[in-house]
């Protein structure tokens, strides 16, 4: 690496992947292993995020960018850059504090994170339920009772008294 | 350079709750995890927890019930809550920039020494 | 937690001489692609603690050559080939696998 010319700032001609070395008359040296630089005139590189434990490599560091981590099969990411790992649970459960639990009587959830919801409410669009909820599926809503045939029957059941939770992070 | 300096009150009642700040400056708040550690007088390091830029937060489990951190990216800070101080938390408290979420800091604040006495 | 434990705890050096200090964690830092998530500080009197050598023997940017650090799984150690007067200070391993992360005890640096 060339000792850089500039008459300002020896440092600003140092390019992503190198650091100005202060040890070394502000030569231009690359940057040590598992970290790096990615912009120019950087006085130290930064040292490369390590996923570790629930965390898998995404992508490798670089001498120019970070790694980028994801989560282990049975985990998802959360949070901007994959910050936390949060445990997946089977569709029809939501992630407790005290682990997976099924979705109560007349909410679902139909995939592997986030909260379970309540089933829609038919009614409050004038409509009827045309397939019955699940701990997986939401309802179904079908015609309004008033366009159904004569005798046919629809029962909407009442929305839950619950609130959604929160997964914990 | 990414600079850090740490700031709150140096004199904290027992009971109480100590509260700090620190400032990043030379460098975006985001993409990194931030923590604080603290030292009390003539003694080793103590890791008390990191926030990732997006709030996702981890704890040193020998405090996690008395310790929140928090962050706020648009003044480029973040911030540490004790509560419930002893004596035994006299120390001084560095913030310092965390590359892997528990792991190598890099970057280092000067330190802020906080008294816990009446 | 996974605790650290440095030898010795005091040492006095001549300048220009070298120096070696261990640390023995109670659990392997070995990681995948032969990554041991330990790391050196040195923390000089009255200053905030600096990072030496990251990753068990990577000296992170900016530090002088004189300072190396090896070793894999339980057993670390960094060494001075000549130790300056600049040198002194608390010298601290930390692991870095786990949260947690856990320091040594601090080996305390001094010229004879």
């Known amino acids: 690496f060339e000792r850089t010319r500039s008459l300002q700032d020896p440092c600003s001609n140092c390019p992503a992947g190198t650091f100005c070395d202060n040890n070394r008359n502000q030569i231009c040296s690359p940057c040590p292993p598992n970290s790096f630089s990615s912009a120019g005139g950087q006085r130290t590189c930064d040292i490369c995020r390590q996923c570790k434990g629930v965390f898998r490599t995404r992508k490798e560091c670089s001498s120019t960018s970070n790694a980028e981590c994801d989560c282990t099969p049975g985990f998802h990411c959360l949070g901007a850059g994959c910050s936390m790992c949060e445990q997946d649970c089977k569709q029809g459960q939501e992630l407790t504090k005290k682990g997976c639990k099924d979705c109560c009587f007349g909410t679902f959830n139909d995939q592997k994170r986030g909260i379970c919801r309540p089933w829609t409410n038919c009614s409050l669009d004038g409509k009827s339920v045309l397939v019955n909820g699940t701990k997986e599926r939401d309802v179904v809503c079908g015609p309004s009772p008033a366009d159904l045939s004569p005798g046919a029957s629809s029962v909407t059941p009442p929305a839950p008294a619950r609130e959604p939770g929160h997964s914990p992070q | 350079q990414v600079q850090l300096q740490e700031s709150g009150p140096g004199l904290v009642k027992p009971s109480e709750t100590l509260s700090l700040t620190c400032t990043v400056s030379?460098?975006?708040?985001?993409?990194?995890?931030w923590s604080w550690i603290r030292q009390p007088p003539g003694k080793g390091l103590e890791w008390i927890g990191y926030?990732?830029?997006?709030?996702?937060?981890n704890y040193n489990p020998s405090l996690k019930s008395r310790v929140t951190i928090s962050v706020d990216t648009s003044k480029n800070q973040f911030s540490l809550k004790l509560s419930s101080v002893t004596a035994a938390d006299t120390a001084v408290y560095y913030c310092?920039?965390?590359?892997?979420?528990?792991?190598?800091?890099?970057?280092w604040g000067q330190g802020t020494l906080v008294t816990v006495s009446s | 937690e996974i605790v650290m434990t440095q030898s010795p705890l005091s040492l006095p050096v001549t300048p220009g001489e070298p120096a070696s200090i261990s640390c023995r964690s109670s659990?392997?830092?070995?990681?995948?692609?032969?990554?041991?998530?330990l790391d050196w500080y040195l923390q000089k009197p009255g200053q905030s603690p600096q990072l030496l050598i990251y990753?068990?023997?990577n000296r992170a940017s900016g530090v002088p050559d004189r300072f190396s650090g090896s070793g894999s799984g339980t057993d670390f150690t960094l060494k001075i080939s000549r130790v300056e007067a600049e040198d002194v200070g608390v010298y601290y391993c930390?692991?870095?696998?786990?949260?947690?992360?856990?320091f040594g005890q601090g080996t305390k640096l001094e010229i004879k």
């Open positions: 659990q392997s830092l070995l990681y995948s692609q032969g990554y041991n998530h």
């Open positions: 030379g460098g975006s708040i985001s993409s990194y995890y």
């Open positions: 930390m692991q870095a696998l786990q949260t947690p992360p856990t």
């Open positions: 926030i990732y830029y997006s709030g996702s937060t």
């Open positions: 310092a920039r965390d590359q892997s979420g528990g792991g190598s800091f890099q970057h």
């Open positions: 990753g068990g023997s």
